[in-house]
């Protein structure tokens, strides 16, 4: 417990102190007091630096004194032989003796008392920044007018904090400006503007005079600006050393002015204003900004439009433009949106053709469609190449976004027909010689494939059976072989309107307009054994002359049997119509004069007994195309004849091209179109 006074005596005092002893006393007086320690008797073995025996006085880490020898008072009125005054409330006294004493020494007697200290004057460091007031056992600090005592109860400062500026424009100065600012102060000013505005501070050099930095460059008094995580300063010196215009990029600014105890100058004055927060003019690739400005600020809205061939995509949908707003944080909204190349996607496949796998499906990419050659060709020669257009479609220069059509190549047999042996008088043939040949099983007859959906035949073949079963692609019509060939299913039969329907067809003598079309349910796939024959052109080039050769094919009656199982064919010339008229009808069902001959009929045959016969009806009389020798066209259809092995009559197809085209057009599916 601290005491106000006390006595300290060496061991055995006033008898001689023992050898080899060490004893210490800890003196403590109350806080706010110093200690007055005085010795009234001192008799300790003398040695140099009191190395043998000594009494030591220690305050904290400091030795206040070390005593030995004999002392007597200099003052006849005072018993004090040695004294110490310390301004601290703790003191340690240590007595030490060595192993021997040459004489008898009696030691020491000492007393201590608590004494008041003057904190205001007794220390090198003044405890108060302004006024220091001493009292017994302590002191207190006080401040001049307009200053206040800080929480540390020692320092005085001016009350210059707490101001919050919210106006869009304002002026702030250091206390007393332009008179010297107060010492030992920390002034904090806050500027808080509406979100979307940045604080801009402006200072003039001459409006700034703050105590200069020390030799190490540290400001003794300083002005600092803090905006979020950015700091400007500290600034000090004569004339403002920083930028005269500070764009803080923040709507909140803290101004901190700190001063020390000395070196007051006139201080500073600044102006601030709120600028709409700027947003950077970003370089967004593949797009244009509207309106275009040198500077964009808070609340500005731009329309960002993608260049042709670019779009903004979200999920499965896209847009070619979007809006972006300069926001209160100085950043653009929708900055995640980027104009990227339009993707036309995987190109659609086409019937009877293919598209090569594109390296890319993005804007500007090119793809090429091809048809399955040699059986199909592209309807439009320039229809093969498509590029990915800005609207996200694959586009062709001629067809636009429409897909190309692969249409069957007509009139080109895979293998040319070669007569080996002398239908009647004809030769064996292979279906590859006549891939257009269609077999009708009831009645046993023929027809010609003219495209994917249509078969041309004679009207008399289908007048009695409007749902005929047809086959393509087989040389043999044996039942077992037909099972493996392609069966065609009719959707509708169209008989020429000029064909006269009879109650008893067997007695027919008028075969005028003996032509019909069969519309198929499903398209026929072309190949080496199945492909169409061409139709004649409308020009005079396709007018037949006597002697022009044509090919006929079918499974009709031969010399040896009523029906052929394997395909037969013959080459025969066109003859004048009178040649057919002159032949006597074999089994007339009427008077010979009753048989009708018209310009819609072609007469052919008469050479070496080669002719078509019962069972060949509807098959094509194929003539080489005068404008393209590689192709055959259907000049005629096997219709009727006076007598097998002589001359035969064929429907003149050229006269019906308009009807054929019109019928097909009016009855096509959208896919065909």
């Amino acid at each position: 417990e601290p005491t106000m006074y006390g006595e300290i005596l060496s061991p055995n005092y006033p008898q001689a102190y023992p050898s080899e002893v060490e004893k210490s006393w800890d003196i403590e007086v109350p806080e706010g007091y110093g200690i007055h320690l005085y010795f009234t008797h001192l008799d300790i073995e003398l040695s140099e630096n009191c190395a043998y025996d000594s009494v030591q006085i220690i305050s904290g880490d400091t030795e206040e004194g070390r005593l030995c020898g004999q002392r007597s008072s200099n003052n006849p009125h005072s018993p004090i032989v040695e004294e110490f005054q310390v301004p601290y409330n703790k003191l340690q006294v240590i007595f030490k003796s060595d192993f021997s004493n040459e004489e008898r020494f009696t030691g020491f007697a000492a007393y201590y008392v608590a004494t008041d200290i003057n904190e205001c004057t007794d220390f090198v460091d003044v405890p108060c920044s302004h006024f220091c007031n001493n009292f017994i056992g302590g002191y207190f600090c006080s401040c001049p007018p307009e200053y206040f005592l800080h929480d540390d109860m020692k320092n005085c400062g001016v009350n210059c904090s707490g101001d919050v500026f919210t106006a869009l424009i304002g002026e702030i100065a250091s206390p007393n400006y332009p008179k010297p600012y107060p010492e030992n102060s920390r002034c904090e000013y806050q500027i808080r503007l509406e979100k979307g505005f940045q604080v801009v501070v402006t200072l003039r050099r001459e409006d700034f005079d703050v105590e200069a930095a020390d030799s190490a460059g540290n400001c003794l008094d300083s002005l600092v600006f803090v905006a979020g995580d950015r700091q400007f300063g500290p600034y000090c010196g004569h004339g403002f050393p920083g930028p005269l215009n500070i764009e803080t990029k923040s709507n909140a600014l803290d101004i901190i002015f700190q001063t020390d105890l000395t070196g007051q100058k006139k201080g500073w004055k600044l102006r601030y204003h709120g600028d709409p927060m700027p947003c950077p003019k970003e370089d967004t690739p593949n797009s244009v900004w509207e309106p275009a400005k040198a500077k964009y600020v808070f609340r500005d809205v731009v329309q960002i439009t993608c260049l042709d061939g670019f779009e903004v995509v979200e999920g499965r949908v896209g847009a070619t433009s979007f809006y972006s707003t300069c926001q209160s944080n100085g950043k653009w909204s929708n900055s995640k949106l980027k104009c990227q190349p339009v993707d036309c996607g995987i190109p659609e496949s086409i019937e009877n053709g293919k598209v090569e796998d594109p390296e890319s499906t993005l804007f500007g990419s090119v793809i090429r469609y091809t048809c399955e050659e040699p059986y199909y060709y592209m309807e439009n020669e320039e229809g093969g190449e498509y590029h990915c257009a800005g609207n996200g479609s694959w586009v062709n220069e001629v067809l636009g976004p429409e897909l190309p059509k692969c249409v069957p190549v007509c009139g080109v047999p895979r293998e040319p027909f070669e007569e080996k042996q002398r239908i009647i008088g004809g030769s064996d043939a292979d279906i590859k010689n006549f891939p257009w040949q269609v077999f009708f099983d009831n009645p046993w007859a023929g027809g010609a494939l003219i495209n994917e959906y249509w078969v041309l035949t004679a009207a008399h073949v289908v007048e009695g059976n409007r749902e005929p079963t047809m086959y393509v692609g087989s040389t043999s019509v044996q039942t077992s072989r037909l099972a493996k060939s392609k069966m065609l299913t009719p959707e509708h039969v169209f008989i020429h309107p000029g064909w006269k329907l009879l109650e008893v067809p067997e007695g027919r003598t008028n075969f005028d307009n003996d032509i019909a079309l069969v519309r198929l349910k499903d398209p026929v796939k072309m190949g080496p054994t199945v492909s169409p024959i061409c139709l004649p052109g409308t020009s005079s080039d396709y007018n037949l002359m006597d002697g022009d050769l044509g090919l006929i094919s079918g499974w009709g009656r031969t010399e040896k049997r009523d029906r052929a199982v394997r395909l037969k064919a013959a080459r025969l010339p066109v003859a004048p119509l009178r040649k057919c008229k002159e032949v006597k009808v074999e089994k007339p069902t009427a008077d010979a004069e009753a048989y009708v001959f018209t310009p819609n009929m072609i007469c052919a045959g008469g050479e070496k007994g080669m002719d078509s016969c019962k069972g060949d009806s509807g098959g094509a009389f194929a003539v080489q195309d005068p404008n393209d020798k590689t192709k055959f066209y259907a000049a005629g259809l096997v219709s009727w004849g006076p007598q097998c092995g002589t001359y035969g009559l064929y429907t003149r197809v050229k006269n019906y091209v308009d009807w054929i085209m019109k019928t097909m057009q009016e009855n096509s599916t959208p896919r065909e179109d």
């Epitope: 809205v301 903004v312 979200e314 979007f322 809006y323 926001q327 929708n334 900055s335 995640k336």
Partner: antibody
Framework: QVQLVQSGAEVKKPGASVKVSCKAS????????MHWVRQAPEQGLEWMGW????????IYAQKFQGRVTITADTSTNTAYMELSSLRSEDTAVYYC?????????WGQGTLVTVSS | DIQMTQSPKSLSASVGDRVTITCRAS??????LDWYQQKPGQSPKLLIY???YRYSGVPSRFSGSGSGTDFTLTISSLQPEDFATYYC?????????FGQGTKLEIK
């Protein structure tokens, strides 16, 4: 497929805070904005604010400024909305939504009831 | 802030009817306007974006038009599943604001 799954319903006392989570799957939230929209009972939709999870930029509607905090944890692909100093008029269904061009996907909603 | 005003507030119609809902912005929002459909107890669903583009999977009977301040959502032939509340929303500038909604009920 794209999904936003929100945390369950909450009952809070006035003055308290609530934190609603929105876990995304089927996409990376860093590539989108994550919005929060609320709907008081029998009322319309009210946009509260958004976050760009890529850089934690946020924009709040003035009405909620100072009371709402939207955050995102890109490691768990989750967005959060915290509303403090709750009052009875904050009783609503809170939705998170994903956007670039528009609010194409929404969470199922979280009912927050504020009652003493 | 931009205010969005929808009209009518509610509307009764029959299956097969043609219905039009309008939305007016307090200032020009160009074409930055979206339409949403919300059924009771469900989250809103996007129907139309950028004023006139139908979102993927939305039936063709829904169409949007307009630019600037006046916008329209049209349902050409109402189906039973279309009875719901419809909201417009501007995404021209933050804060993104919604209309107060139009409740479409069965007559």
């Amino acid at each position: 497929q794209v999904q936003l799954v929100q945390s369950g319903a909450e009952v809070k006392k006035p003055g308290a805070s609530v934190k609603v989570s929105c876990k995304a799957s089927g996409f990376n939230i860093k590539e989108y904005y994550m919005h929060w929209v609320r709907q008081a009972p029998e009322q319309g939709l009210e946009w509260m604010g958004w976050i760009d999870p890529e850089n934690a930029d946020t924009i709040y509607a003035q009405k909620f400024q100072g009371r709402v905090t939207i955050t995102a944890d890109t490691s768990t692909n989750t967005a959060y909305m915290e509303l403090s100093s709750l009052r009875s008029e904050d009783t609503a269904v809170y939705y998170c939504a994903r956007s670039r061009l528009f609010f194409a996907y929404w969470g199922q909603g979280t009912l927050v009831t504020v009652s003493s | 802030d931009i205010q969005m005003t929808q009209s009518p507030k509610s509307l009764s119609a029959s299956v097969g009817d043609r219905v039009t809902i309008t939305c007016r912005a307090s200032q020009d929002v160009r074409t930055a306007l979206d339409w949403y459909q919300q059924k009771p107890g469900q989250s809103p669903k996007l129907l139309i974006y950028s004023a006139s583009y139908r979102y993927s999977g939305v039936p063709s009977r829904f169409s949007g038009s307009g630019s600037g301040t006046d916008f329209t959502l049209t349902i050409s032939s109402l189906q039973p599943e279309d009875f719901a509340t419809y909201y417009c929303q501007q995404q021209y500038t933050t804060p993104y604001t919604f209309g107060q909604g139009t409740k479409l009920e069965i007559k």
